[in-house]
Interface confidence: medium
């Protein structure tokens, strides 16, 4: 028998994929452990290997489909299973009534590129991906720059409160190497928490003209 | 085989309180959602709520805060615990479950049981 | 809530006749069901995802439809059949039932 604390936590992209973390104390680490998926109302089940990610938590990604069919609604509730194997048979480990659209986390938004960049701002685009047509304009946004010699973790949050997958950063310094960033969280469910962010975008604003102020 | 035995009916006074069971066979209530559905007399089906596989709940909002569903998993039961009753909760009490893994649509039925609110 | 209204509420017809029983949602619904209830029994699903037979169900009753319209057919009315059927929506919660159809024979 496996004791200790249990988290067992997951999040729907929106689409096709359910992600799940479980993390056990004092789990054995040889155990075979999966999720199983058994929605209320549909006519298919996933299941999905749990793989290490620490000395005590596993994870998973359940693929319910083609990454952007929309395998799941706000009625639906699928039940996830942890399953471990006990020598010849499986043991439940932990179970949750899982809301897809009250556990929401997207994928990074993608695509990013300089639409234009001039010395002291930058218009830059980029695009959501695999998101549910369900949420029609209801996604807002949050970015932020990195500038040289700061971390990402110093790097002021700014937020789009609506779905706006453009920004023009302002009051930038001539001839500087930038990074941008940006994540996106749909406004519905009481779990919804905020995509990973996306790739960096790098970019350097133009240099000043010689002979103007800057 | 699949069987749903509902009992607990009965007559109450308004305002009473009354706890249908459904005792389930041939499945484990921890691996499928069961439904509590209803039948006035002469008159059409109304779903009352449900207690999935996780033990999570969800209610029709005309009887949430009256009726609670609830479970005992080593007696392989379901509850429905239906408090300040009126008159026109008089009806038959069913509880269903749907059918095998992902089957919509609830394919086993209790043979119900009558609940009459009367002074 | 999801309101589901079926016509006729009642009808009757003869041994060997079509009968057709219409569902209208008050809004799109995706999955639709439909039971058969005789009197004084539990309801019986007859028809899941709006037009797949359940298990045992004679191929005479078939379902079609999409969107806020659906209909039922018993292709060839059989004495057994004199039963109030119900159609029902599992898009949205609360699940809403139609107020039934009852059939009965001439």
């Known amino acids: 028998a496996v004791n200790g604390t249990s988290r067992f936590t997951c999040f729907y992209n929106s689409r096709a994929n359910i992600s799940c973390v479980w993390s056990q104390d004092g789990a054995l680490q040889d155990t075979s452990c999966q999720v199983h998926a058994w929605p209320d109302r549909r006519r298919w089940n996933q299941t999905c290997e749990l793989l290490p990610v620490s000395q005590a938590s596993w994870a998973c990604n359940l693929i319910l489909g083609t990454p952007d069919s929309q395998k799941l609604t706000a009625v639906d509730i699928v039940t996830l299973r942890v399953m471990c194997r006990e020598g010849v048979r499986w043991r439940m480990m932990a179970i949750q009534d899982f809301k897809p659209f009250e556990n929401l986390r997207l994928m990074a938004p993608i695509s990013l590129q300089v639409v234009h960049v001039e010395t002291h701002r930058c218009n830059i685009s980029w695009k959501i991906s695999q998101a549910s047509h369900y949420f029609e304009r209801h996604l807002e946004f949050e970015a932020r720059t990195l500038s040289p010699g700061h971390t990402w973790e110093e790097a002021p949050l700014m937020t789009l409160k609506q779905k706006q997958e453009w920004i023009c950063l302002e009051t930038l310094t001539p001839d500087t190497q930038y990074e941008f960033q940006v994540r996106v969280k749909p406004l519905q469910g009481e779990f919804t928490t905020w995509s990973p962010w996306s790739q960096p975008l790098a970019f350097r604003t133009k240099p000043a003209a010689l002979g103007k102020d800057t | 085989e699949v069987q749903l035995l509902e009992s607990g009916g009965g007559l109450v006074q308004p305002g009473g309180s009354l706890r249908l069971s459904c005792a389930a066979s041939g499945f484990s209530v921890t691996s499928y959602g069961v439904h509590w559905i209803r039948q006035a007399p002469g008159k059409g089906l109304e779903w009352l709520g449900a207690?999935?596989?996780?033990?999570?709940?969800q209610y029709n909002a005309a009887v949430k805060g009256r009726f609670t569903i609830s479970r005992d998993n080593s007696k392989n039961t379901l509850y429905l615990q239906m408090n300040s009753l009126r008159a026109e909760d008089t009806a038959v009490y069913y509880c269903?479950?749907?059918?095998?893994?992902?089957?919509?649509?609830?394919?086993?039925w209790g043979q119900g049981t009558l609940v009459t609110v009367s002074s | 809530d999801i309101q589901m209204t079926q016509s006729p509420s009642s009808l009757s017809a003869s041994v060997g006749d079509r009968v057709t029983i219409t569902c209208q949602a008050s809004?799109?619904?995706?999955?639709l069901y439909w039971y058969q209830q005789r009197p004084g029994k539990a309801p019986r699903l007859l028809i899941y995802d709006t037009s797949n037979l359940a298990s045992g169900v004679p191929s005479r009753f078939s379902g079609s439809g999409s969107g806020t319209s659906y209909t039922f057919t018993i292709s060839s009315l059989q004495p057994e059949d004199i039963a109030t059927y119900y159609c029902?929506?599992?898009?949205?919660?609360?699940?809403?039932f139609g107020q039934g159809t009852k059939v009965e024979i001439k």
């Open positions: 269903a479950r749907a059918g095998d893994a992902n089957y919509d649509g609830f394919a086993y």
């Open positions: 809004q799109s619904v995706s999955f």
């Open positions: 029902q929506q599992w898009s949205t919660y609360p699940l809403t």
């Open positions: 207690i999935w596989s996780g033990g999570s709940t």
